[in-house]
C-alpha cells in the first residue's frame, strides 16, 4: 500500500563504467521498522509466485547477514528512515531500474530508481547567460549530473586551451533532491573573445581527461574599426587629395550607421566608409576618425592625424619675459604656423639681422641694456619662407647707472653753513621715483634728488645718495670736508705730576680735540695779559705770584676757541709772618690786648706756635693770642711760628708795652 511508505530520492542517477553511484535516499514506513530489504536490478513481478524476479544486487535478512559477494553494493541505510545506497564500482550493465524491496511486519513495497550508466564519462553541460556583452562580468556554468563520494572529479575551464582556473568556483550536491557537480566561472569577456571556444573539461582525481563540453562565445560588442588613409603617412600639401577608408574588423551585431569625425566633431554629409577630401586646405589638418554604430553602441577607430603642409605664416615673437631685468636670461620664441615645422629661422634686432641665430629660440643668458629693442624673425620650411611679423619689444630694466652725489656749495664748507647736495645719475629704466641718503639725518625731506642740510655740523664727514627705481643704486660717499674752529680746547698740566710747590718747574699744555683746517695758533693769557704763543707755557721756578687763572686760545682760519679758565695753585711754606697788635703795641694794664700772627701761606697755616722774649713757647696755638686783662708783666717782645703742609715760617719780634693805669700810678 503506497500510502504506508513515503520515499525521497533522485528519480534518475547517472554514472559511467568504472565510476560509482551514490544514491541518497530517505523513507518512512508508517507501520513500523524495516525487517527485510532486497535491492533488485530490473525487477519484474511474477503473478504466479506473487514475488519479484530479477537480479538481486543486495539482500539483508532478519538476522542481518549479507552475502560476501555483495561488497560492491552497500546499503547505508537503517530500519526507519535512511535508504542510501552505494555501488562502487558501477558497471555498464548496472543501467536500468533499481528496485528497493522493503518489508515491514505487515507491509511490503517496491520503490524504483532509474540508473543510467554510460560506457564512457559523459560530458558536462555549459550554460551561458542569454546575452554576453564585452567587458561586462558574466557567470558561465558547467553542470555535470554526477557526484559520488568514492570517485572524486574536477571541472576545469579553458579558453582555447588556456586555463581560467582562479575565477571558477566548484560545488557538489548529493541530496535526495539532486546529484550534481557544478563549476561557475566569473568572466569579463572582451570583444576579442567573440566566436572563440570555451571548454569545460571533466577530469578525474589525478587530473586525467574524462570528457568535455565546448561552447562558442557570442560576445556582443561595439564595432571594432581600422582606418586606412591614402597617402599612408597622411601628409599632404595644400591642394592635394586625401582618401580615408573605414574597415570594420568586428561587429556583433551587424553595424547600422557610419560617420566621420574631425577633432571630435562630426563631419556633415559623410556617411559612407570612404571619406574623400579634394584640394585640401591647411584648415583641414587635424585628427580624423570614423565612427560606426550597432545596437550595442558606437565604436571609434584610432585617430589619423592629417597634416596639410604649407609655407610658414607671418611670424610673431614671444619674449620670456619682458620687461627683463639686466643680468637675467631671456628667451625669444619665433612663432609661425607652418607644416612641416620650420627648419630655419632668421632673427632681427632693431631691423638688423642677428648673425648665427637660426633656431626657433634665441637664448640670451645675460641681458644688458643694449639688448633692448624690437625683435622680429622669419621662419622657413621646405615649402618656402614666411614673412617677418611686427616683432616684439624687449624692455630691459636696470638700476640707475653712474649715480653721483654732488655738493652744490662753494668750497670750503664751514660749520653752520647750509649745504645743498644733489643726487645725479646717468640713466635709469624704469625712471627714478625716489632717492635715499646716508646717513639718515633729521634733514629736510629730500625731493627731486636735492638734499639741504641746514646748519651743517662740524662732524658731517661723508654723505651718500641712492637713486631708486625698482632698485636703489648708491653713489660713492662724498666728503663734505666741513671746516670749523678748534674744538674742546683745555689747559692741561704736564708737570709736575703732583701739586705745584713754589720753586717747581711747571709746564702747562694747551690741548684741543680737532681743528679743520689743521693749522692753528696758540695764545696764553692770565688776567687779560698775553703770556705766550706756544702750545706750552713753561715756568722754570714757579713762585706764588705766578698762581692765578690761566686761559689758552687756539685759533685757525675759521675762528678761535678759548679754554675754560684754569687755576694755577702754588703751594709754599708760611712766609711774611708778622705779629700785629690790637688795639696797638702800647696797652694800659687791665685792658685787653690781642696779638695776631699774620702770614702768607698756601695751603693756609694749620698750626701756630707763640714764643715770648725768652723764646719760651706759650701754651697758645691759635692765630690770635688774647691777653685779658693785660698786665705790666706781659710787656716784652713776642714772635710767632706758622706751620702748613709745606713747612714752617717765623715772624720777627714785635714788642708789646703795657703801662700802668692811672689808678696804679695814683696808688703809688
Amino acid at each position: 500500500d503506497s500510502s504506508k511508505w513515503v520515499f525521497e530520492h533522485p528519480e534518475t542517477l547517472y554514472a559511467w563504467e568504472g565510476a560509482c553511484v551514490w544514491i541518497p535516499c530517505t523513507y518512512r514506513a508508517l507501520d513500523g521498522d524495516l525487517e527485510s530489504f532486497i535491492l533488485f536490478h530490473n525487477p519484474e513481478y511474477n503473478k504466479n509466485t506473487s514475488k519479484f524476479d530479477g537480479t538481486r544486487l543486495y539482500e539483508s535478512t532478519k538476522d542481518g547477514k549479507v552475502p560476501s559477494e555483495q561488497k560492491r553494493v552497500q546499503f547505508l541505510g537503517d530500519k526507519n528512515k535512511n535508504c542510501t545506497l552505494s555501488i562502487h564500482p558501477v558497471h555498464l550493465n548496472d543501467s536500468g531500474q533499481l528496485g528497493l524491496r522493503m518489508e515491514s511486519k505487515t507491509e511490503k513495497w517496491m520503490e524504483r530508481i532509474h540508473l543510467n550508466v554510460s560506457e564512457r564519462p559523459f560530458p558536462p553541460h555549459i550554460q551561458l547567460p542569454p546575452e554576453i556583452q564585452e567587458s561586462q562580468e558574466v557567470t558561465l556554468t558547467c553542470l555535470l549530473n554526477f557526484s559520488c563520494y568514492g570517485y572524486p572529479i574536477q571541472l576545469q575551464w579553458l579558453l582555447e586551451g588556456v586555463p581560467m582556473r582562479q575565477a571558477a568556483v566548484t560545488s557538489t550536491s548529493l541530496t535526495i533532491k539532486s546529484v550534481f557537480t557544478r563549476s561557475e566561472l566569473k568572466f569579463s569577456p572582451q570583444w576579442s573573445h567573440h566566436g572563440k571556444i570555451v571548454t569545460c573539461q571533466l577530469q578525474d582525481a589525478d587530473g586525467k581527461f574524462l570528457s568535455n563540453d565546448t561552447v562558442q562565445l557570442n560576445v556582443k560588442h561595439t564595432p571594432k574599426l581600422e582606418i586606412k588613409v591614402t597617402p599612408s603617412d597622411a601628409i599632404v600639401r595644400e591642394g592635394d587629395s586625401v582618401t580615408m577608408t573605414c574597415e570594420v574588423s568586428s561587429s556583433n551585431p551587424e553595424y547600422t550607421t557610419v560617420s566621420w569625425l574631425k577633432d571630435g566633431t562630426s563631419l556633415k554629409k559623410q556617411n559612407t566608409f570612404t571619406l574623400n577630401l579634394r584640394e585640401v586646405t591647411k584648415d583641414q589638418s587635424g585628427k580624423y576618425c570614423c565612427q560606426v554604430s550597432n545596437d550595442v553602441g558606437p565604436g571609434r577607430s584610432e585617430e589619423v592625424f592629417l597634416q596639410v603642409q604649407y609655407a610658414p605664416e607671418p611670424s610673431t615673437v614671444q619674449i620670456l619675459h619682458s620687461p627683463a631685468v639686466e643680468g637675467s636670461q631671456v628667451e625669444f620664441l619665433c612663432m609661425s604656423l607652418a607644416n612641416p615645422l620650420p627648419t630655419n629661422y632668421t632673427w632681427y634686432h632693431n631691423g638688423k639681422e642677428m648673425q648665427g641665430r637660426t633656431e626657433e629660440k634665441v637664448h640670451i643668458p645675460k641681458i644688458l641694456p643694449w639688448h633692448a629693442g624690437t625683435y622680429s624673425c622669419v621662419a622657413e620650411n621646405i615649402l618656402g619662407t614666411g614673412q617677418r611679423g611686427p616683432g616684439a619689444e624687449l624692455d630691459v630694466q636696470y638700476p640707475p647707472k653712474k649715480v653721483t652725489t654732488v655738493i652744490q656749495n662753494p668750497m670750503p664748507i664751514r660749520e653752520g653753513d647750509t649745504v645743498t647736495l644733489s643726487c645725479n645719475y646717468n640713466s635709469s629704466n624704469p625712471s627714478v621715483t625716489r632717492y635715499e641718503w646716508k646717513p639718515h639725518g633729521a634733514w629736510e625731506e629730500p625731493s627731486l634728488g636735492v638734499l639741504k642740510i641746514q646748519n651743517v655740523g662740524w662732524d658731517n664727514t661723508t654723505i651718500a645718495c641712492a637713486a631708486c627705481n625698482s632698485w636703489c643704486s648708491w653713489a660713492s660717499p662724498v666728503a663734505l670736508n666741513v671746516q670749523y674752529a678748534p674744538r674742546d680746547v683745555r689747559v692741561r698740566k704736564i708737570k709736575p705730576l703732583s701739586e705745584i710747590h713754589s720753586g717747581n718747574s711747571v709746564s702747562l699744555q694747551c690741548d684741543f680735540s680737532s681743528s679743520h683746517p689743521k693749522e692753528v695758533q696758540f695764545f696764553w693769557e692770565k688776567n687779560g695779559r698775553l703770556l705766550g704763543k706756544e702750545s706750552q707755557l713753561n715756568f722754570d721756578s714757579i713762585s706764588p705770584e705766578d698762581a692765578g687763572s690761566y686761559s689758552c686760545w687756539v685759533n685757525n682760519s675759521i675762528g678761535q676757541t678759548a679754554s675754560k679758565a684754569w687755576t694755577l695753585e702754588v703751594l709754599y711754606a708760611p712766609r711774611r709772618l708778622r705779629v700785629s697788635m690790637s688795639p696797638g703795641d702800647q696797652v694800659m694794664e687791665g685792658k685787653s690786648a690781642t696779638l695776631t700772627c699774620e702770614s702768607d701761606a698756601n695751603p693756609p697755616v694749620s698750626h701756630y706756635t707763640w714764643f715770648d722774649w725768652n723764646n719760651q713757647s706759650l701754651p697758645y696755638h691759635s692765630q690770635k693770642l688774647r691777653l685779658e686783662p693785660v698786665k705790666v708783666q706781659h710787656s716784652g717782645a713776642y714772635w710767632c711760628q706758622g706751620t702748613n703742609s709745606v713747612g714752617k715760617g717765623r715772624s720777627p719780634l714785635s714788642t708789646l708795652t703795657v703801662y700802668y693805669s692811672p689808678e696804679t700810678i695814683g696808688r703809688r
Epitope: E160, G161, V162, P163, R165, Q166, Q203, G207
Partner: antibody, heavy 116, light 116 residues
Framework: EVQLVESGGDLVKPGESLKLSCEAS????????MSWVRQTPDRRLEWVAT????????YYSDSVKGRFTISRDNVKSTLHLQMNNLKSGDTAIYFC?????????WGQGTTLTVSS | QLVLTQSSSASFSLGASAKLTCTLS???????IEWYQQQPHKPPKFVME???????YTGDGIPDRFSGSSSGADRYLSISNIQPEDETIYIC?????????????FGGGTKVTVLG
C-alpha cells in the same frame, strides 16, 4: 608518449634577433595551449609567453612584451618564439611546455646567450 | 600583483618529514597553485596541484609520500619519510587570467637538502 624538442638556441649580441622552435609529438597538438618558460642563470623560472590552442590568443610577460612573438603551426605541430632586440637579461635556458591546466609536459630546453 | 614567496633552502634528516611553504600575495590567497620539482640539468616536473581548501592531486610517478595542504595564503608540500632522491629544487607556480590577459608566475624555488 608526449615529446617536446626545442631548437635554435645560440650565442648572439645585444640588439640582435633569433627564432626558437619546438617540435611536438605524442599528443593532439591543436588541442593544447603551448608556452615558453625560461630559466635564468640564477636558476629562477620565468614564464615568457603562451599561445592558445588554435592561436587566436597570445599572452606575454611584461619583460618581453613588444620584443618577442609566439606563434604556432598546428599542421606541423610546431611552436615558435621570434625574439627581437635581445638583451643580456634574456640569457637563459628556454623550455617549451604544454599547458593543460598546469605545465604538464616540458622539453629539455635550448640555451640562449646574449653577450657583447 | 600576483606573487609567490618561497624560502630559498631547507635541510631535513633522512627519513624525517618535510614541509615546504609557498605563500601567495594576500589578495590572491584563494588561488590554486602547482608544485614542480627540478633535478639539476633537467626540465621541471609537475608534482601536485593544491586548492585553497587543501584538496590536491599528484602527478604521474609521484610517490604517495608526497601530500599537500593549505592554510590561508600558504600552500604546503609535505614529504614523509624523506629519501635521498627527494633532494632537489621545488618550485611553486600559479596562473591567472584577468580580462583578456593570462599570466603565469613562479616562486623563487626551495632547494631541499637531505642530511645523513
Amino acid at each position: 608518449e608526449v615529446q617536446l624538442v626545442e631548437s635554435g638556441g645560440d650565442l648572439v649580441k645585444p640588439g640582435e634577433s633569433l627564432k626558437l622552435s619546438c617540435e611536438a609529438s605524442g599528443f593532439t597538438f591543436s588541442n593544447y595551449a603551448m608556452s615558453w618558460v625560461r630559466q635564468t642563470p640564477d636558476r629562477r623560472l620565468e614564464w615568457v609567453a603562451t599561445i592558445s590552442s588554435i592561436g587566436s590568443f597570445t599572452y606575454y610577460s611584461d619583460s618581453v612584451k613588444g620584443r618577442f612573438t609566439i606563434s604556432r603551426d598546428n599542421v606541423k605541430s610546431t611552436l615558435h618564439l621570434q625574439m627581437n632586440n635581445l638583451k643580456s637579461g634574456d640569457t637563459a635556458i628556454y623550455f617549451c611546455a604544454r599547458l593543460g591546466v598546469y605545465f604538464d609536459s616540458w622539453g629539455q630546453g635550448t640555451t640562449l646567450t646574449v653577450s657583447s | 600583483q600576483l606573487v609567490l614567496t618561497q624560502s630559498s633552502s631547507a635541510s631535513f634528516s633522512l627519513g624525517a618529514s618535510a614541509k615546504l611553504t609557498c605563500t601567495l600575495s594576500s589578495q590572491h590567497s584563494t588561488y590554486t597553485i602547482e608544485w614542480y620539482q627540478q633535478q639539476p640539468h633537467k626540465p621541471p616536473k609537475f608534482v601536485m596541484e593544491i586548492k585553497k581548501d587543501g584538496s590536491h592531486y599528484t602527478g604521474d610517478g609521484i610517490p604517495d609520500r608526497f601530500s599537500g595542504s593549505s592554510s590561508g595564503a600558504d600552500r604546503y608540500l609535505s614529504i614523509s619519510n624523506i629519501q635521498p632522491e627527494d633532494e632537489t629544487i621545488y618550485i611553486c607556480g600559479v596562473s591567472d587570467m584577468i580580462k583578456d590577459q593570462f599570466v603565469y608566475v613562479f616562486g623563487g624555488g626551495t632547494k631541499v637538502t637531505v642530511l645523513g
